[in-house]
Amino acid sequence: QPDAINAPVTCCYNFTNRKISVQRLASYRRITSSKCPKEAVIFKTIVAKEICADPKQKWVQDSMDHLDKQTQTPKT
């Protein structure tokens, strides 16, 4: 069986139609189309809830950029 020893990749079948405030977001991960039916972004909120979002939407791209910058900027 392929990749049987690897944890299964979670998939998204629907995307949220609500913009999520960046203050509520803790992290994200990308899901590629070779592993799942849809390319997706999964945001994890500060209360550890996971939400599927459409990577083609501007607010999703902006939120990823924001989280990337947060990660790159060391907190003092």
């Epitope: 299964p8 979670t10 998939c11 998204c12 079948y13 799942c36």
Partner: nanobody
Framework: EVQLVESGGGLVQAGGSLRLSCAAS????????MGWFRQAPGKEREFVAA????????YYADSVKGRFTISRDNAKNTVYLQMNSLKPEDTAVYYC??????????????????WGQGTQVTVSS
């Protein structure tokens, strides 16, 4: 746990057709998505097609759109992959897999964690 058994693979000439079947047992499948994946020698496994058990929404990889059709028979707990206009590059081991949906519409699923043993499809030119 979900048990999946594929059948229907074989050797076919380019341009020909095959129908793969995946018989599922062990669960009530209403909250599952059933998928077909394939893995060619030396390549990564790739998504081919999927269908929601409840509602029947379908999803396809771009490489098979218009050529492959996924369907299900709820009474038989079986998912089918009708493959037409086959090409040599479709040669691979085809796997059936099951994915449990999240609790809400926008939650990610559990992932394709249950797999069949695979069935070989060879397309000769």
């Amino acid at each position: 746990e979900v048990q999946l058994v594929e059948s229907g693979g074989g050797l076919v000439q380019a341009g020909g057709s095959l129908r793969l079947s995946c018989a599922a047992s062990g669960r009530t499948f209403s909250s599952y998505v059933m998928g077909w994946f394939r893995q060619a020698p030396g390549k990564e496994r790739e998504f081919v097609a999927a269908i929601r058990w409840s509602g029947g929404s379908t999803y396809y990889a771009d490489s098979v759109k218009g050529r492959f059709t996924i369907s299900r028979d709820n009474a038989k707990n079986t998912v089918y992959l009708q493959m037409n206009s086959l090409k040599p590059e479709d040669t691979a081991v085809y796997y059936c897999a099951a994915d449990l949906l999240g609790d809400s519409d926008y939650e990610p699923s559990s992932g394709f964690g249950s797999w069949g043993q695979g069935t070989q499809v060879t397309v000769s030119s």
